[in-house]
Interface confidence: medium
């Protein structure tokens, strides 16, 4: 593992069953309690849950666990201390870190990534660090939808 | 530090609307990661959600008052405003702005300072 | 909508003693509650966030646990200063609701 520190769990929020729809961006609608940022809508939450318990509540929300484009793609939530879990996990198959579309993980994205235990899952900080945990620890997470 | 101040008149005559304006100081209105809330408190009694008002516009509002509830919100003065139509002597209470974070506590974490709205004639 | 049911009405206590307020929520709102102190002519202060978080500023002798439909708000040793009404808040779901408030009172 690298010297970043998780800090104490900060919880925020959960989707309530109202889906109107906000537009938050200069192109997109998300539902409600989501942040619209450039084109892509957010989920932030609160509740801590296992990798898989994470990748599930963001199906069920019809999206998906982060898969970053970019390392300042959540700068609106740079002031953040947190760790989340995002789509990121080891294919024994591909011998490689794929994200949950089945795309590679870039060598730019995480430079550290080759020390990274192929057993954990990926948490992600919003200024750009990330930590391998056991995919059965618990953490917030983040859902993204990418609405163009 | 995040302030916000209330204004508005303190008397509405039964079945005209009720107006109330708050202005954000120390911070931008639009920020991605707050909404923006209205909460009424009658005399004696417990706290009532009116609505929220993202930056967009986009609102979401009480079910009990949507029908007579509008939220809006002006980034170029970084103030958002509450109009209650065809208020009753029900809707005397003291009204707050405030805001909710998106991203930590998700609970009313700055208040305005209130405003005693009184409906009589 | 989610209702909040808060239990005792009225807490009479002295200075120095300990306080347990109960919120009882009618369907499960995970960890998503806050409490909130008020003081008369006041608007009411943040305490508690995601049910156990403390607000910034917030003395530590006021905790916060529970989770799903019953949760408490507890101050370890009150203060003059804590004798007020303490509300709960919900945004498990929308709307956003509260509860009728505990009103806390020196004996």
């Known amino acids: 593992k690298n010297s970043f520190t998780k800090l104490s769990i900060e919880p925020a929020f959960t989707p309530g069953p109202n889906i109107e729809l906000q537009k938050d961006s200069d192109c997109c609608s998300c539902q409600e309690k989501w942040v619209g940022y450039r084109c892509n809508c957010y989920f932030i939450s609160s509740e801590q849950k296992t990798w898989n318990e994470s990748r599930h509540l963001c199906a069920s929300q019809k999206s998906s666990l982060l898969q970053l484009q970019n390392t300042d793609e959540l700068d609106f939530m740079s002031s953040s201390q947190q760790f989340y879990w995002i789509g990121l996990s080891y294919s024994e198959e591909h011998t490689a870190w794929l994200w949950e579309n089945g795309s590679a993980l870039s060598q730019y994205l995480f430079p550290s990534f080759e020390t990274f235990n192929t057993k954990n899952c990926i948490a992600y900080n919003p200024n750009g660090n990330a930590l391998d945990e056991s995919c059965e620890d618990k953490n917030r997470y983040i859902c993204k939808q990418q609405l163009i | 530090q995040v302030q916000l101040q209330q204004s508005g008149p303190g008397l509405v005559k039964p079945s005209e609307t009720l107006s109330l304006t708050c202005t954000v100081s120390?911070?931008?209105?639009?920020?991605?990661?707050?909404?923006w809330g209205w909460i009424r408190q009658p005399p004696g009694k417990g706290l009532e959600w009116i609505g929220s008002?993202?930056?967009?516009?986009?609102?979401y509002y009480n079910p009990s008052l949507k029908s007579r509830v509008t939220i809006s919100v002006d980034t170029s003065k970084n103030q958002f405003s509450l109009n209650l139509s065809s208020v009753t002597a029900a809707d005397t209470a003291v009204y707050y702005c405030?805001?909710?974070?998106?991203?930590?506590?998700?609970?009313?974490?700055?208040w305005g300072q209130g405003t005693m709205v009184t409906v009589s004639s | 909508e989610i209702v909040l049911t808060q239990s005792p009405a009225t807490l009479s206590l002295s200075p120095g003693e300990r306080a347990t307020l109960s919120c009882r929520a009618s369907q499960s709102v995970s960890t998503y509650l806050a409490w909130f102190q008020q003081k008369p002519g006041q608007a009411p202060r943040l305490l508690i966030y995601g049910a156990s978080s403390r607000a910034t500023g917030i003395p530590d002798r006021f905790s916060g646990s529970g989770s799903g439909t019953d949760f408490t708000l507890t101050i370890s040793r009150l203060e003059p200063e804590d004798f007020a009404v303490y509300y709960c808040q919900q945004y498990g779901s929308s709307p956003i609701t509260f509860g009728q408030g505990t009103r806390l009172e020196i004996k």
């Open positions: 120390g911070g931008s209105i639009s920020s991605i990661i707050y909404y």
């Open positions: 405030a805001r909710l974070p998106l991203t930590g506590e998700f609970a009313f974490d700055i």
């Open positions: 008002i993202y930056y967009s516009g986009s609102t």
